[in-house]
């Protein structure tokens, strides 16, 4: 089955500059299929722009300016580039690639969608650093022992654009677990949001891991907000004194930094 | 120029009650074109649903059943047993790939019918009410209530910012809650919540026990910590690897 | 009005570490957008960035010096603190603090700067 | 990492518009703040976001920004003008300065 990835979730740049979108076809040989993109203008329909089939072929919607977009294909890393040039307002919209995938029965086929880069304009850089700002909350102690059961919470602030993604995975596992969130807040001209992920008294012990995907996260790799294990058994709290104990009672979190 | 039209904008449907979503075609008959019906949930995922043909997107063959009406010109999506997962915009689109002739292989889209979902009537439930806190950062967890209809206080005396709350649907068909605020006075912040004519206080439910905390952090640049050192880590980030992690006891 | 005041030794001895306080008042570092940053100038020469520290107590320092400076503030007292570890003559300057305030995504420039302390570093 | 070019000296006759550039890559795409320090003096911000005139600063002073050049514009140039002007942006909340100009009124 083919699948679609479109690694950039955001992407922000100033009026007049080119910006470049990627898809990366996989479960499929990108030579052999025609990849398809859209766009989807905020409160309009989603519109064919341009599709480049399996021979090289570029097909470009009527009423869409030549110039304007340009489509490739780059077998080697099976990914298909949306290239818009001298971008304007006019431009913003979240972009789709898409390809029709054969279904197990002969004749049958549907279109799989990517999902989506979400293309944002700005009149100027941002001045400041805008990846996502964490901060985790752990259960409280009244929650594990009253309802066998604890909720951990990422709070992620300060960042820009408001496109992000947020899903929660234990350690050494990739299920995606079932979260809540929060929507996407506006705090002066950057953004905030909160994931929170409740789990049974007996998933307390395992680490778990609040992943943020987002365009200003830095060298572009999502960012792992690690949640350590809670020993319900061992850790007890007075919620009425909460600084009052030596650091030796409770658990060291001792993080070692080998960055550059 | 054929044209999809939505029936509706907006479609509220009740966890396990049916909902019928309708898309008509303007400008054609709708028999010449296939219909297709996606699903775009938060982030912006688009889904496939169902194509004509009896072709169902993976995991929508037993909840969804697409039909067309070529009598009234319009397609149909029945969604037979709404869970809070089948919150999201649907659209409707078409194509005549594999009609031959002059086929179309581009989708040509409708606007979209934002489907919101609530939890079904029931009798109503008190909330459960708890607080996280971190450095200044103070959460207000409050769980499975129902009905919706809440109003969260975080009392303190010593205000930095509030947000307002986010109330979704619990795994359970009811609500769950949070509220965040940043207050100079964190240690001393407690919640309470007005819900069905009552009011329910975090300190309702803490348990007298006697240590800090789960985690006290050593500071690193690149880890966010709070100001003092009985808080909670802001967090510990990992970008590729740009930390090792051990805990001792 | 918005005043800044840097406070420190004016002469420390090479490898010693320098500890340099901007105590200000008119505004509040807890306050959206409102951020502190050191800048030093030596002698003749051009302006140096050296680190800021914002209100959400993020703190950025220039790549240069980052494995020298730590810069810290204590809300309640109006302060930031500057350190800088293993002092050389060459770090002979006037240390100037200033306030940034901003929007989260832009900054309206170093709009209120402190009179400076000259700090000489000599044996 | 990001740098901003300036010529050491400009000189003008009094009367006259002074004309200070900044260099640096795109700079146009970034905003630009311009500080003046008199001599034995702290800066002070005459100028912010390209063309922003902090209150108390004289409406001669004025500013713009495109393509890789900043310009601080100082018409009707007067004695108490001369100092040393320097040009800011900023990197992802780093500030950088450029190396300084001494405007000199003959």
């Known amino acids: 089955a083919g699948h679609l990835e479109q690694p950039q979730i955001s992407s922000t740049k100033t009026l007049s500059k080119t910006a470049r979108l990627e898809c990366v076809v996989s479960g499929i040989t990108i030579s052999a299929t025609s990849v398809y993109w859209y766009r989807e203008r905020p409160g309009e329909v989603i519109q064919f722009l341009v599709s480049i089939s399996y021979d090289g072929t570029v097909r470009k919607e009527s009423g869409i300016p030549s110039g304007k977009f340009e489509v490739d294909r780059i077998p080697e890393t099976s990914t298909s580039t949306l290239t818009i040039h001298n971008v304007e307002k006019q431009d913003i919209a979240t972009y789709y690639c898409a390809l029709w995938e054969a279904q197990q029965e002969l004749g049958k086929k549907i279109k799989v969608f990517g999902p989506g880069t979400k293309l944002i304009i700005t009149d100027k850089q941002l001045d400041a650093d805008v990846s996502p700002k964490p901060t985790i909350f752990l259960p409280s102690i009244a929650e594990t022992k009253l309802q066998k059961a604890g909720t951990y919470l990422c709070l992620l602030e300060k960042f820009f654009p408001d496109v992000i993604k947020i899903h929660w995975q234990e350690k050494k596992s990739n299920t995606i677990l079932g979260s809540q969130e929060g929507n996407t807040m506006k705090t002066n001209d950057t953004y905030m949001k909160f994931s929170w992920l409740t789990v049974p008294e007996k998933s307390l012990d395992k680490e778990h891991r609040c992943i943020v995907r987002h365009e200003n996260n830095k060298n572009g790799v999502d960012q792992e907000i690690i949640f350590p294990p809670i020993k319900t058994d061992v850790i007890t709290m007075d919620p009425k004194d909460n600084c009052s104990k030596d650091a030796n009672d409770t658990l060291l979190l001792q993080l070692t930094n080998t960055s550059a | 120029a054929i044209e999809l039209v939505p029936e509706h904008q907006t479609v509220p449907v009740s966890i396990g009650v049916p909902a019928t979503l309708r898309c008509s075609m303007k400008g054609e008959a709708i028999g010449n074109y296939y219909i297709n019906w996606y699903r775009k949930t938060q982030g912006n995922t688009m889904t496939f649903i169902y194509r004509e043909k009896d072709i169902y997107g993976p995991g929508f063959k037993d909840n969804f059943q697409g039909d067309i009406d070529i009598a009234k010109n319009l397609a149909v999506l029945k969604i037979l047993a709404p869970s809070e997962r089948d919150e999201g915009s649907y659209y409707c689109a078409c194509d005549t790939l594999g009609m031959g002739g002059e086929y179309t292989d581009k989708l040509i889209f409708g606007k979209g019918t934002r489907v919101t979902v609530e939890p079904r009537s029931q009798p109503h439930t008190k909330p459960s009410v708890f607080v996280m806190k971190n450095g200044t950062n103070v959460a207000c967890l409050v769980k499975e209530f129902y009905p919706k209809d809440i109003r969260i206080n975080l009392v303190s005396s010593k205000k930095i910012t509030e947000f307002d709350p986010a109330i979704v649907i619990s795994p359970s068909g009811k609500y769950n809650a949070v509220k965040l605020g940043k207050y100079e006075d964190s240690n001393s912040v407690t919640c309470s919540v007005q819900h069905d004519n009552k009011t329910v206080h975090s300190t309702d439910f803490e348990v007298k026990t006697d240590s800090t905390d789960h985690v006290k952090p050593k500071e690193t640049e690149n880890t966010k910590q709070p100001s003092k050192s009985c808080h909670k880590p802001k967090a510990i980030v990992h970008t590729e690897k740009v930390n090792m992690m051990s805990l001792t006891v | 009005q918005v005043q800044l005041q840097e406070s420190g030794p004016a002469l420390v001895k090479p490898t010693q570490t320098l500890t340099l306080t901007c105590t200000f008042s008119?505004?509040?570092?807890?306050?959206?957008?409102?951020?502190v940053s050191w800048i030093r100038q030596p002698p003749g020469k051009a302006l140096e960035w050296l680190t800021l520290i914002d209100w959400f107590d993020d703190k950025y320092y220039s790549t240069s010096l980052k494995t020298r400076l730590t810069i810290s503030k204590d809300t309640s007292k109006n302060q930031v603190v500057l350190t800088m570890t293993n002092m050389d003559p060459v770090d002979t300057a006037t240390y100037y603090c200033a306030r940034i305030r901003g929007t989260g995504a832009y900054y309206y420039g170093l709009d209120v700067w402190g009179q400076g302390t000259m700090v000489t570093v000599s044996s | 990492s990001y740098e901003l070019m300036q010529p050491p000296s400009v000189s003008v006759s009094p009367g006259q518009t002074a004309s200070i550039t900044c260099s640096g890559n795109?700079?146009?795409?970034?905003?630009a703040s311009w500080y003046q320090q008199q001599p034995g003096q702290s800066p002070v911000l005459v100028i912010y976001q390209d063309n922003k005139r902090p209150s108390g600063i004289p409406e001669r002073f004025s500013g713009s920004n495109s393509g890789n050049t900043a310009t601080l514009t100082i018409s009707g140039t007067q004695a108490m003008d001369e100092a040393d002007y320097y040009c800011?942006?900023?990197?992802?909340?780093?500030?950088?300065f450029g190396g300084g100009t001494k405007l000199t009124v003959l």
């Open positions: 008119g505004f509040s570092l807890s306050s959206s957008g409102m951020c």
């Open positions: 800011q942006a900023w990197d992802s909340s780093k500030v950088v």
């Open positions: 795109e700079l146009g795409d970034k905003y």
